[in-house]
């Protein structure tokens, strides 16, 4: 459950949307999941999967609303700050994660083009930075009403306090576990080799172990592929370059924490591969 | 033009402070950060903090926490560096410098202040 | 703390001659910035990001690397450029100097 212990906001604003797409956006994520997506468009904070169902307090997404709405208003008063220049895309990172001792620990660092170059320092309430750029937006947001204070207790009170709160009410989504659905399939390589590639599809939580064993022996981890699906849960393959002919004396073993027991993937026929 | 000008000359007691200025001219003093450096004979710089003169804020590196303070005064475009409880090590010639360059460089720098620490 | 160790710490070029001198950092740096200082004045910006010339600096200057290892290169060496040059990383708190390439002239 460690990976669950952390509820983070990835924030974007870009200073030149494209027509019809937006200006801001969010992706709320508890671990690995993302739960929430807001954007000017729409202008509304949103559960993500499975929080659709999550049994929340009646006013919960109203302040997720008005908090993101604040945020994009900050985020498009930066691109003032920075003036005519350009196009600039402002990127932030906010939350907190609960340590062992279930102390709240935050994070708030922003990024202009893909650089990180400011953060918020709460020791001293305002946000830090020394390229010309952070002076310019640190002090155009220090001037907005009670900014700094805001930023302060959204990291340090309604942060930890949601990140409680989803790990009471929503321990269902966060405990699913769902086992992957596997394939091992060879296919000719250069002259002489074939490529073994085993996959892994729909799992979830993300942590998955791929390996090969030739004759029951560890035969190595491959060169591997990892990514999500859009319904939350993960793929992953890895290949082996193995010598033709030799293809059946592999097999792939899989290790997550939706199965029991280490799987054992055979090769497939190939009048079962498509 | 933009100009750094620092205070002059300082000769101090061991256990001592010393409060050097740095007076910035030809840019808005506001808009970039103020940088310190420490350059000590026959040795390399180190970067000793710096301070946004907008809003306050200021960030040291943490060998110097406890040695300086960084401060600023905007009505005079002014930045301070107070150095307390001076010793030997501290002898050195102390530069400001304009974080105004691409990614903050230090683009412009004072002509540095001399601290001597002797008893 | 990343260190930065330039190389070698004194070197001598003729005039005409190419001058390459090294800095090797003990962590990723994602850019390098060098500085020319001169026998009593104040350091000068030299190069920032890496590979751009600061304004004023002469074209046989150039810089380049990535990650752990970066260099200053003069194509033609000129007698104005004996200095002492520093190079310097903003990636990773503290901002730390290498300890300096003295270049004289022969």
């Known amino acids: 459950a460690e990976s669950h212990l952390s509820l983070l906001y990835h924030l974007t604003a870009v200073s030149s949307p494209a027509p019809g797409t937006p200006a801001f956006w969010v992706s709320g994520w508890l671990g690995p999941q993302q739960y929430l997506s807001y954007n000017s468009l729409r202008g509304e904070a949103e559960p993500c999967g499975a929080w659709v169902w999550e049994n929340q307090v009646s006013w919960y997404w109203e302040k997720e609303t008005t908090d993101l709405r604040i945020k994009e208003k900050l985020f498009l008063e930066a691109f003032k700050a920075l003036g005519g220049k350009g196009p600039y895309t402002l990127q932030g990172l906010l939350g907190c994660e609960l340590g062992p001792d279930n102390t709240s620990v935050p994070t708030a660092k922003f990024a202009l083009n893909g650089e990180e170059f400011m953060n918020f320092d709460l020791k001293q309430g305002t946000w830090g930075g020394d390229w010309p750029e952070a002076l310019a937006i640190s002090q155009r947001w220090q001037q907005q009403d009670k900014a700094a204070n805001k930023e302060l207790t959204f990291l340090l009170f309604s942060c930890p306090h949601r990140l409680r709160e989803h790990l009471e009410r929503g321990r269902g989504n966060l405990e699913w576990k769902e086992p992957p659905s596997m394939r091992l399939k060879a296919r000719p390589s250069s002259p002489g080799f074939s490529v073994l590639t085993c996959s892994a599809f729909s799992f979830y939580p993300p942590e998955l172990q791929l390996r090969f064993l030739r004759n029951g022996l560890a035969a190595g981890t491959g060169q591997g592929d990892f990514g999500p699906n859009s319904d939350g849960s993960f793929h992953a393959s890895s290949s082996l370059t193995v010598k033709s002919g030799d293809e059946h004396h592999y097999c792939c073993i899989v290790q997550h924490a939706g199965l029991a027991q280490p799987l054992r993937v055979e090769l497939e026929s190939p009048a079962k591969s498509s | 033009e933009v100009q750094l000008q620092q205070s002059g000359v300082e000769l101090a007691r061991p256990g001592a402070s010393v409060k050097m200025s740095c007076k910035a001219s030809g840019y808005t003093f506001s808009s970039y950060a103020m940088q310190w450096v420490k350059k000590r004979p026959g040795q390399g710089l180190e970067w000793i903090g710096y301070?946004?003169?907008?809003?306050?804020?200021?960030n040291y590196n943490q060998k110097f926490k406890d040695k300086a303070t960084l401060t600023a005064d905007k009505s005079s475009s002014t930045a301070y560096m107070h150095l307390s409880s001076l010793t030997s090590e501290d002898s050195a010639v102390y530069f400001c410098?304009?974080?105004?360059?691409?990614?903050?460089?230090?683009?412009?720098w004072g002509q540095g202040t001399s601290v001597t620490v002797s008893s | 703390d990343i260190v930065l160790t330039q190389s070698p710490a004194l070197m001598s070029a003729s005039p005409g001659e190419k001058v390459t001198m090294t800095c090797s950092a003990n962590?990723?740096?994602?850019?390098m910035y060098w500085y020319q200082q001169k026998p009593g004045s104040s350091p000068k910006l030299w190069i920032y990001?890496?590979?751009n010339l600061a304004s004023g600096v002469p074209a046989r200057f150039s810089g380049s690397g990535s990650g752990t290892s970066y260099s200053l290169t003069i194509s033609s060496m000129e007698a104005e450029d004996a200095a002492t040059y520093y190079c310097?990383?903003?990636?990773?708190?503290?901002?730390?100097f290498g300890g300096g390439t003295k270049l004289e002239i022969k």
């Open positions: 310097h990383q903003r990636s990773s708190y503290p901002w730390t």
């Open positions: 962590s990723s740096v994602n850019y």
């Open positions: 410098a304009r974080g105004g360059g691409l990614r903050g460089a230090m683009d412009y």
């Open positions: 990001s890496t590979s």
């Open positions: 301070i946004n003169p907008g809003t306050g804020y200021t």
